[in-house]
């Protein structure tokens, strides 16, 4: 906190301008007037105050506003917005898209902080659900926001949402997030037509069940390994050698360079070995002929 | 990628005015500040100011009202000016953007100016 | 305005040595200190900022410290590439300085 001095004669601001970058902390504190400020916060931004005016400023806007300051001023905080804290924000209630863009713009570069975790949580709550305007903003500064999220949280966004999500979007969702996401989607791109449908929905796929594989293995879709990969392996499991060979079409040569891995290698074990030789890839570790499979998982589920 | 690159005469005489312009390619000159920053030989660097891309600027009082920066938004280009130049004005004259308050992070190659007559 | 003093101004170091230069400040800046690397003719390249944070793409080998006054720059496992002038700057309050720089050479 700064001291309170008297403001030296003809210092006194009359104007928020670049003059003031060459005050001292103490004379910023005594020759500022906090409503000036406040009024005139647009041009805050358009200056390039050190972070320790910074702190000053926020100190006086702090005094003026202790229950929160209003969105007039939010919106212009710029650098300001960095010396916040959670608990800050908290006390805002910022409802303007165009606020969050204003204030993820400065932060822009850096990690997500705890400050912008605590806006984009408080601007969220306050708009009820996760709209696609707010998706497409949140996904343009943090790709990964969607997987940051919980699957509690995930179900509040709307299936037209799905339609803002990039593939990058997606990259660090783990099954769970996938689980809640793939239905959306599929409902989200319901109407359009088969190639298209596929390269939408690719991203969502390992959300998918096996009978929505198995839907897919029926429409020349030629599924890259990559995306196999990120199947949920107990929806690969009860494909057919021949489900997975029209699921992947060209690219299921790939199964020999991952059959060491999931789901590949437990998928690989629940295959009669000589469904798996007519692929002539060299697939071992299939089950052996003339051995009886049974589906312990069937029995338990009828006794 | 953001790109600076400084040019002007690398020789000045004494009492002239120093005149260089840096141009900027792989990214608008706004929404950004902009410094000139001059390093002369066997001295530490010197700070001489900053030029918004709306034109506003601020500069170090040790110039004396000598510099002044203009920018030319359509040329995406940020200009100096440094008049009654001295030999203490030979320097390695360097434009940057900044990035957070009082940081530097993108510097265009730099300029060598000698003030000879 | 605040006067940025290095210490060494010049060093001699070998390859895979561990070295430390010192950046003091004449006033208290908090942590508000960058560290640059300059090699001839070339722009000085941003390593450090707020004291002790590695810019994007700076390799770990590189570490800052201090708070206040006295600060220091550590390089550790000193390859050909490191070897180069180092220059500290402080912004906490204008006119932003720079300290006069570190030359550090091959022994």
């Known amino acids: 906190e700064v001291e309170k001095t008297a403001c030296p004669s003809g210092k006194k601001a009359r104007e928020i301008d670049e003059s003031l970058i060459f005050y001292k902390k103490w004379e910023l504190e005594a020759c500022v007037d906090a409503a000036l400020l406040a009024t005139q916060m647009d041009r805050v931004n358009a200056i390039p105050f050190t972070y320790e005016q910074l702190d000053v400023l926020k100190h006086k806007l702090d005094e003026l506003y202790p229950q929160g300051y209003p969105e007039s001023v939010i919106q212009h905080l710029g650098y300001l917005f960095l010396k916040m804290s959670p608990e800050d924000i908290r006390k805002w209630n910022v409802t303007s898209l165009e606020t969050l863009k204003a204030l993820l713009e400065v932060n822009k570069g850096h990690e997500m902080s705890p400050q912008v975790a605590t806006l984009i949580d408080r601007f969220v709550k306050g708009r009820g659900q996760l709209d696609k305007d707010t998706l497409d903003t949140l996904t343009a500064f943090y790709p990964g926001y969607l997987c940051s999220l919980s699957p509690e949280e995930l179900s509040s966004v709307p299936p037209s949402s799905i339609w803002a999500v990039r593939p990058q979007d997606l990259d660090t969702c783990d099954p769970r997030q996938l689980d809640v996401l793939y239905p959306k989607a599929r409902l989200a791109f319901q109407n359009m037509n088969g190639s298209e449908y596929f390269v939408k929905i690719q991203s969502f796929l390992g959300g998918a069940p096996t009978e929505d594989l198995k839907a897919l293995s029926q429409q020349n879709v030629s599924m890259d390994l990559a995306t196999f990969m990120k199947l949920r392996t107990d929806a690969v499991l009860p494909l057919t050698v021949a489900e997975v060979q029209k699921l992947l079409g060209p690219h299921v040569e790939g199964l020999k360079a991952e059959e060491r891995h999931r789901p590949v290698r437990d998928w690989i074990l629940r295959q009669r070995q000589d469904d798996l030789d007519t692929l002539g890839l060299g697939l071992q570790g299939g089950i052996p002929n003339g051995y009886l499979v049974l589906d312990l998982s069937m029995q338990e589920a009828l006794s | 990628q953001l790109q600076l690159q400084e040019s002007g005469p690398g020789l000045v005489k004494p009492s002239e005015t120093l005149s260089l312009t840096c141009a900027v390619s792989?990214?608008?000159?706004?929404?950004?500040?902009w410094t000139w920053i001059r390093q002369s030989p066997g001295k530490a660097m010197e700070w001489m100011g900053y030029i918004h891309y709306s034109g506003r600027t601020n500069y170090n009082p040790s110039l004396e009202s000598r510099a002044t920066f203009s920018v030319d938004t359509s040329k995406n280009q940020i200009s100096l000016k440094l008049n009654s130049v001295t030999a203490a004005d030979t320097a390695v004259y360097y434009c940057t953007k900044v990035g957070d308050p009082g940081l530097f992070d993108y510097w265009g190659p730099g300029t060598l100016v000698t003030v000879s007559s | 305005d605040i006067v940025m003093t290095q210490t060494p101004s010049s060093l001699s170091a070998s390859v895979g040595d561990r070295v430390t230069i010192t950046c003091r400040a004449s006033q208290g800046i908090s942590n508000y200190l960058a560290w640059f690397q300059q090699k001839p003719g070339k722009a000085p390249k941003p390593l450090i900022y707020?004291?002790?944070s590695l810019q994007s793409g700076v390799p770990s080998k590189f570490s800052g410290s201090g708070s206040g006054t006295d600060f220091t720059l550590t390089i550790s496992n000193l390859q050909p590439e490191d070897f180069a002038t180092y220059i500290c700057?402080?912004?906490?309050?204008?006119?932003?300085?720079f300290g006069q720089g570190t030359r550090l050479e091959i022994k």
């Open positions: 707020a004291a002790s």
């Open positions: 700057q402080q912004y906490s309050s204008y006119p932003i300085t």
């Open positions: 792989g990214g608008s000159i706004s929404p950004y500040y």
